[in-house]
Each structure stands twice: as structure tokens, then as C-alpha cells.
């Protein structure tokens, strides 16, 4: 379960792949496309609020029915849409949604050597926001596989004008 | 109740080597990324290592690169930190730390060890 | 790699005073920064987390703030258990670095 209702930190950043393709969000036919692409020099980064939450894990050893926290995020590129999982589709998509957010918002965020992250959905552990033919996509990751495969590890590069949504 | 309770420490002469170990009870060991840090006497802390829950993944500081191993055993619930070519310099009290989240590393260092201490001298 | 500053080194102060500690890193490192204290022969304890949340069984009267660079730590009453020396800690990127440290001591 989510610890608080409210995000213990919130940031802006852009968000690139591994190999430094910027991740871009665009508006086309009122729904929001996700793209993985080159960015031309000039061309601004786009920006992401990421909110960070707590989630207890469920106990296996400790007696308080508790171990341990994860850290929890969700992306939001512009105000209102939030990325989602769509395990069915295997699918990152934008949705318009209303705060509680549901769990396929929500991403546990997991720090990788080299100060990359990758991101695992709540609602199917062990699957993960990879790169997928210059897209988004759903990767399902074996554990007992180094969870370090390039294409599920993305970089936040801060953008410090703080914390405001960006419309 | 987590508890962490490192070992190995002792004098050693420069150039020589020690293998410091941490024995995690109270929480499941396997699913933390775990830390060293160590402290020289009347000193401040300084990071020493990290190794990823798994084990696949290592990192080291500088000034102990090539020279220290961080290595752990998840069936025996220990961490180990092997020292190796030891100088004056490393002579400190090194403790072992469990990162506050399971995943991410963002949170700091919630649990630590008592520390052990290693004396590098002729 | 990131590094960290801390002042004062050492504050002298009084049961009751509110004492504040700043802490600066040389680039931006969002909220990911923790507190410590350490008294002499102990492990450090974890106080603050994610720049301003307080560790479980804290005292309320320890508190954190700032984002980017710049962070302080207030404690807003000081207890005789409080003298000790305080850390900060960048957790935001490898290799993690801690500040120098500030000393509280007895006025």
C-alpha cells in the first residue's frame, strides 16, 4: 500500500534512454503520442514532473507486518495526463486522470549503477517501461537476469525551476 | 528489529589485507542494495562501496578502487567488503549500512552497523 | 563527483536554542539528501530523509528543507541529547558524498 496520499518530493526533469534519445510527449488528434527520438541541437528538452511516493512492502521476516519501503513515481508531461501501464496491450500510455491516481500510474523506482533509472509497474512486478522500436513499451524482465539490459535504463536530467507544473 | 553487525576488523601491517564482514538480521537481506562507509579517527564519514541487492552490480570510491572488494552472500545473509593493499590512510572505522528503500537509494542510509575498526600500521 | 559543504563546522548553544545547519551541494541534486547525527563512539542515525522527511521516531523538533543546492537543518529546541555532530549526504548520485560535518557542542 501507498504510505501517504501525498508525494514525499516532487521534481522536473527530462527523461532520455540509455544511449541519450530523449523521450518526447506530442499532441495529436487530442490524445498525447510518446516518442523516443534523436533531438536536433536546438530543440528543448521535455519536461516531466515526477511525484515520489512510499509504499511498504509486505512482510516476509520482520514481525510488524512490514519490510521496508520502495520508492514509488509517477511521470506527469503536462498537467492532468499521467504515463500508465497497459498490461494488457504491453503498452505506456498518457491518460487523463483524476487524483486518486490508479495503480498503473504508480512505478517502483529502482537506481541502477552509472545513475541510471528504470521504472517497474506497480500492478506487474518484474515488468518494466523499456524502449521498444522508438517507442514505450512494456518489458518483462527475469530476475534472475541482470536487470541491467540497456533498454529499460533511463537517465533524469533536473531541470531546477522547481516544482511547478509545466502547461 | 533490523540489526546489522560487522566483524574482521583488527591491525594490519601496510600493504597487507583484512576481509571485514556484516551479518544483516531483522529484515530481508536480499532485497536491499547495501552500503560501506567508513570513518578515520576524529575524522568525518566518507563513502567507501555499494553493491546492488543481487550482487550484479558494484561500486567503489576512488580512493579505494581496485584496491577494496564488496561482495555479499544472500543465502547467508551477509556483506563482506575485502580490503586489500592497505595503507596508512585506510585505517578507520568501517561501518556497514542498509539503504532506507528497498530499490532506491534516494533515501539515504536508514540502519547501520556498530562499525569494526582496521588499524594500518607498522 | 558531487561535493558537499557544510556551516558552521561547530556551533556552541544553549538547551532551548534553535539551531540551524546548512548544507551545499555543488550541483543540483533535487531532494535527495539525508541528515545524520553521530555522537562520539556511536553509529551515525539517520534524522532526515528526502530532504525534509523526518526518519521514523524522531523528535518533531528536528526538521529539514531546501531543494537544488542549498538545505538546512533546524532543530527548533535544543535537548541535552542533541549535542553531537550532524551530517548531510547527497543520496541523489554515485559516489555518495557527506558533508564535513557540524559539531553542536555545550555553550
Known amino acids: 500500500s501507498i504510505t501517504g496520499i501525498s508525494p514525499i518530493t516532487e521534481s522536473l526533469a527530462s527523461l532520455s534512454t540509455y544511449n541519450d534519445q530523449s523521450i518526447t510527449f506530442a499532441l495529436e488528434d487530442e490524445s498525447y503520442e510518446i516518442y523516443v527520438e534523436d533531438l536536433k541541437k536546438d530543440k528543448k528538452k521535455d519536461k516531466v514532473l515526477l511525484s515520489y511516493y512510499e509504499s511498504q512492502h509486505p512482510s516476509s521476516e520482520s514481525g510488524d507486518g512490514v519490510d521496508g519501503k520502495m520508492l514509488m513515481v509517477t511521470l506527469s508531461p503536462t498537467k492532468d495526463f499521467w504515463l500508465q501501464a497497459n498490461n494488457k496491450e504491453h503498452s505506456v500510455e498518457l491518460h487523463k486522470c483524476e487524483k486518486p491516481l490508479p495503480d498503473q500510474a504508480f512505478f517502483v523506482l529502482h537506481n541502477r549503477s552509472f545513475n541510471c533509472v528504470s521504472f517497474e509497474c506497480k500492478t506487474d512486478p518484474g515488468v518494466f517501461i523499456g524502449v521498444k522500436d522508438n517507442h514505450l513499451a512494456l518489458i518483462k524482465v527475469d530476475y534472475s537476469e541482470n536487470l541491467g539490459s540497456e533498454n529499460i535504463l533511463f537517465k533524469l536530467s533536473e531541470i531546477l525551476e522547481h516544482h511547478h507544473h509545466h502547461h | 528489529e533490523v540489526q546489522l553487525v560487522e566483524s574482521g576488523g583488527g591491525l594490519v601491517q601496510p600493504g597487507g589485507s583484512l576481509r571485514l564482514s556484516c551479518a544483516a538480521s531483522g529484515f530481508t537481506f536480499s532485497t536491499y542494495s547495501m552500503h560501506w562507509v567508513r570513518q578515520a579517527p576524529g575524522k568525518g564519514l566518507e563513502y567507501v562501496s555499494t553493491?546492488?541487492?543481487?550482487?550484479?552490480?558494484?561500486y567503489y570510491a576512488d580512493s579505494v578502487k581496485g584496491r577494496f572488494t564488496i561482495s555479499r552472500d544472500n543465502s547467508k545473509n551477509t556483506l563482506y567488503l575485502q580490503l586489500g593493499s592497505l595503507r596508512p590512510e585506510d585505517m578507520a572505522v568501517y561501518y556497514c549500512?542498509?539503504?532506507?528503500?528497498?530499490?532506491?537509494?534516494?533515501?539515504?542510509?536508514?540502519?547501520w552497523g556498530q562499525g569494526t575498526l582496521v588499524t594500518v600500521s607498522s | 563527483d558531487i561535493q558537499m559543504t557544510q556551516s558552521p563546522s561547530s556551533v556552541s548553544a544553549s538547551v532551548g536554542d534553535r539551531v540551524t545547519i546548512t548544507c551545499r551541494a555543488s550541483q543540483g541534486i533535487t531532494s535527495w539528501l539525508a541528515w545524520y547525527q553521530q555522537k562520539p563512539g556511536k553509529a551515525p542515525k539517520l534524522l532526515i530523509y528526502a530532504a525534509s522527511n523526518l526518519q521514523s521516531g524522531v523528535p518533531s523538533r528536528f526538521s529539514g528543507s531546501g531543494s537544488g543546492t542549498d538545505f538546512t537543518l533546524t532543530i527548533t529546541s535544543l535537548q541535552p541529547e542533541d549535542f553531537a555532530t550532524y551530517y548531510c549526504?547527497?543520496?541523489?548520485?554515485?559516489?555518495?558524498?557527506f558533508g564535513p560535518g557540524t559539531k553542536v557542542d555545550i555553550k
Open positions: 549526504q547527497q543520496a541523489n548520485s554515485l559516489p555518495f558524498t
Open positions: 549500512a542498509r539503504q532506507t528503500y528497498t530499490s532506491s537509494w534516494y533515501g539515504g542510509f536508514d540502519s
Open positions: 553493491i546492488n541487492n543481487n550482487g550484479d552490480t558494484t
